[in-house]
């Protein structure tokens, strides 16, 4: 568990990708807030529940997010 801190960001390290969409169980987008002044994207991998921080500025990750949200909207009744 991360130490308590004044700034409550989650990500210490970020990946530019590539990350296969099929490998992701959950994609969490945490908007910038008073406690963390940056957007954070956390992918939970299906295989081992490993959580990876993704680079919000990366073109690959932006495309991934777009594809992920399209997939979710197709699933919705």
């Amino acid at each position: 568990i991360p130490l308590a801190r004044t700034v409550r960001c989650n990500c210490i390290h970020i990946d530019d990708g590539p990350v296969r969409m099929r490998a992701i169980g959950k994609l969490e987008i945490i908007p910038a807030s008073l406690s963390c002044p940056r957007v954070e994207i956390i992918a939970t991998m299906k295989k081992n529940d490993e959580q990876r921080c993704l680079n919000p500025e990366s073109k690959t990750i932006k495309n991934l997010m777009k594809a992920f949200s399209q997939k979710r909207s197709k699933r919705a009744p």
Partner: antibody, heavy 123, light 107 residues
Framework: QVQLVESGGGVVQPGRSLRLSCAAS????????MHWVRQAPGKGLEWVAV????????YYADSVKGRFTISRDNSKNTLYLQINSLRAEDTAVYYC????????????????WGQGTLVTVSS | DIQMTQSPSSLSASVGDRVTITCRAS??????LAWYQQKPEKAPKSLIY???SLQSGVPSRFSGSGSGTDFTLTISSLQPEDFATYYC?????????FGGGTKVEIK
């Protein structure tokens, strides 16, 4: 290939200050959490501090809290460790290391290490 | 802080021997364990992460196993270049902590 080169060590008197640097190349420094780990002569490894990829988060070992400051300059691909109020027990080789990044909040396991810089605190 | 206890603290072995080093955590750390090799006057080198994943470029004679509190590093057939000190390290929670090290010496 990944290269980390520490500098700034030397012999210092107790109570004085020192700034260590770690020049990084061969990977995307601005994406990487970075750590300092130290090793006293003939002893084991002790984690000192970590800083996140853009310098917002810093954690410290209890033994150095309040005296050490970790920082980074992503435009220069350089990591720093400012050490104040040096004590004899700070005598060690100081290594910088790259974060593996498997936990979303930073794993604290280390992929690559520099060659280290020796800090000797002696009057 | 989580305490890591390594055993033995040193061992003597011959080239070709199978060597096993154990590491015990003071509380459960899932599989968040790494192993490092350090040679005299050199920086540590990452061997294994996530208890059993081999770091890229590390020979397959090195393997890791375990989860929870008990972990093992095995060198299946000791080579001359493997004589070194080995450290385990937990990264389940901050601060990351290391075992005291196991020195593998030539018999």
């Amino acid at each position: 290939q990944v290269q980390l080169v520490e500098s700034g060590g030397g012999v210092v008197q107790p109570g004085r200050s020192l700034r260590l640097s770690c020049a990084a190349s061969g990977f995307t420094f601005s994406n990487s959490g970075m750590h300092w780990v130290r090793q006293a002569p003939g002893k084991g490894l002790e984690w000192v501090a970590v800083i996140d990829y853009d310098g917002i988060i810093q954690y410290y070992a209890d033994s150095v809290k309040g005296r050490f400051t970790i920082s980074r300059d992503n435009s220069k691909n350089t990591l720093y460790l400012q050490i104040n109020s040096l004590r004899a027990e700070d005598t060690a080789v100081y290594y910088c290391a790259t974060e593996r990044g498997t936990h979303y909040y930073g794993s604290g396991s280390f992929d690559y290490w520099g060659q280290g810089t020796l800090v000797t605190v002696s009057s | 802080d989580i305490q890591m206890t390594q055993s033995p603290s040193s061992l003597s072995a011959s080239v070709g021997d199978r060597v096993t080093i154990t590491c015990r955590a003071s509380q459960g750390i899932s599989s968040w364990l790494a192993w490092y090799q350090q040679k005299p006057e050199k920086a540590p080198k990452s061997l294994i992460y996530a208890a059993s994943s081999l770091q890229s470029g590390v020979p397959s004679r090195f393997s890791g196993s375990g989860s929870g509190t008990d972990f093992t590093l095995t060198i299946s057939s000791l080579q001359p270049e493997d004589f070194a000190t080995y450290y385990c390290q937990q990264y389940n929670s901050y601060p990351p902590t290391f075992g005291g090290g196991t020195k593998v010496e030539i018999k």
